[in-house]
Interface confidence: low
């Protein structure tokens, strides 16, 4: 009868719907797992960025301090070379004076 | 009849199944969107990490170079101070000799 045909079609549609539901459920679970993983990676990566930024800031400031120290030492070397030069000149002058006297 | 009752129950079950399917489909779409967003964030963050790492490596190597330069300059300062000291001593000695002669 038409009734039983409709019923049979309904049962088939219901079975198909159940299959689709299971398939979607599996897909959803897989996608949720992937999402969790991607979020964890993003969070972990953000922490790495913070860490690297801290490290970089520290090294930048260290480089600036070292640059200042280099400048200071270079000035010191220049000054000492100048003093040495003056002393040598004085020494030579005094030697000349000694020789002439 | 029993047949029509079973059919009615079947139709109700099918309607419920359809609702569940729609709900799952919506959830899946939302989760896929979130996944795409999280993956994009993770990728973008990973690029930032690479950039920061490169900068940090450069700074680390720059700091080492500067450290070597500081050491070199400090040695130079020590050497020059020593030379100055020697010259001063020589100068004093020669002054004493001059006074005594």
């Amino acid at each position: 009868t038409a009734n039983s045909v409709a019923c049979r079609d309904g049962l088939r549609a219901q079975a198909e719907c159940r299959n689709t539901t299971h398939l979607l459920q599996r897909q959803l679970t897989r996608t949720q797992d992937s999402l969790l993983q991607a979020e964890t990676q993003a969070n972990s990566c953000n922490l790495t960025v913070v860490t690297l930024q801290e490290s970089l800031e520290k090294k930048v400031s260290q480089a600036l301090e070292q640059q200042a120290r280099i400048k200071e030492l270079e000035n010191e070397v220049t000054k000492l070379n100048q003093e040495l030069e003056n002393l040598r000149i004085q020494k030579e002058t005094s030697s000349t004076v000694q020789v002439n006297s | 009849t029993a047949n029509s009752v079973a059919c009615r129950d079947g139709l109700r079950a099918q309607a419920e199944c359809r609702n569940t399917t729609h709900l799952l489909q919506r959830q899946l779409t939302r989760t896929q969107d979130s996944l795409l967003q999280a993956e994009t964030q993770a990728n973008s963050c990973n690029l930032t990490v690479v950039t920061l790492q490169e900068s940090l490596e450069k700074k680390v190597s720059q700091a080492l170079e500067q450290q070597a330069r500081i050491k070199e300059l400090e040695n130079e300062v020590t050497k020059l101070n020593q030379e100055l000291e020697n010259l001063r001593i020589q100068k004093e000695t020669s002054s004493t000799v001059q006074v005594n002669s």
Epitope: S44, L47, T51, E54, S55 | Q53
Partner: antibody, heavy 115, light 108 residues
Framework: QEQLVESGGRLVTPGGSLTITCTVS????????MGWVRQAPGKGLEYIGI??????TYYASWAKGRFTISKTSSTTVDLKMTSLTTEDTATYFC??????????WGQGTLVTISS | ELDMTQTPSSTSTAVGGTVTMNCQAS??????LAWYQQKPGQPPKLLIW???DLASGVPSRFKGSGFGTQFTLTISGMQREDAATYYC??????????FGAGTNVEIK
């Protein structure tokens, strides 16, 4: 001179609670993160947690929920421990931790959990 | 969560010898790594921070190196007073820190 002194360590029965204190001198607490580290007899160092300059706290995963770090005054940092077990028997060190490096340590205070 | 894997757990060398120990971080920690020396009955003493910077007053025979996840502490010209347990401490992000299990260094 800069100094950290831990106090309050004593014998406690399992399940009990205890608060130990770190008193600082010569240090401006507002400028440093302060941490707690413990060491069970004959074992290695174990990081418990840290309190930042803005009073934000971070804990090792095993310490979350049972351990609480707080700045109780301008010179003291407390470590509150609850639901203590024999596994918590250790010397507890207070540490000043700027820039990711714990650079100043107290001498430690011994906490013993036993019935 | 950050895990620090330290190797070896113990080692020995003669006076004047060289000792090397390693620390591996489970995450990329840049140069946020410190090394400590601990002798029995004493609190740990900072040797090296930011992977390679010597703490003040630390002899130059101690050398730290590494970046990212792999770090090394080398003691060149081992002295009797260097016999101790050495720990690495990694920092990840602002608050996450973890110690290695330690390396016991003895004199032969």
């Amino acid at each position: 001179q800069e100094q950290l002194v831990e106090s309050g360590g004593r014998l406690v029965t399992p399940g009990g609670s205890l608060t130990i204190t770190c008193t600082v001198s010569g240090i401006d607490l507002s400028g440093y993160a302060m941490g707690w580290v413990r060491q069970a007899p004959g074992k290695g160092l174990e990081y418990i947690g840290i309190i930042g300059t803005s009073d934000t706290t971070y804990y090792a995963s095993w310490a979350k929920g049972r351990f609480t770090i707080s700045k109780t005054s301008s010179t003291t940092v407390d470590l509150k421990m609850t639901s203590l077990t024999t596994e918590d028997t250790a010397t507890y060190f207070c540490v000043r931790s700027p820039g990711g490096s714990a650079d100043l340590w107290g001498q430690g205070t011994l906490v013993t959990i036993s019935s | 969560e950050l895990d620090m894997t330290q190797t070896p757990s113990s080692t020995s060398t003669a006076v004047g010898g060289t000792v090397t120990m390693n620390c591996q971080a489970s995450q990329n920690i840049g140069i946020n790594l410190a090394w400590y020396q601990q002798k029995p009955g004493q609190p740990p003493k900072l040797l090296i921070w930011y992977a390679s910077d010597l703490a003040s007053g630390v002899p130059s025979r101690f050398k730290g190196s590494g970046f990212g996840t792999q770090f090394t502490l080398t003691i060149s010209g081992m002295q009797r007073e260097d016999a101790a347990t050495y720990y690495c401490l990694g920092t990840y992000g602002s608050g996450v820190r973890a110690f290695g299990a330690g390396t016991n260094v003895e004199i032969k």
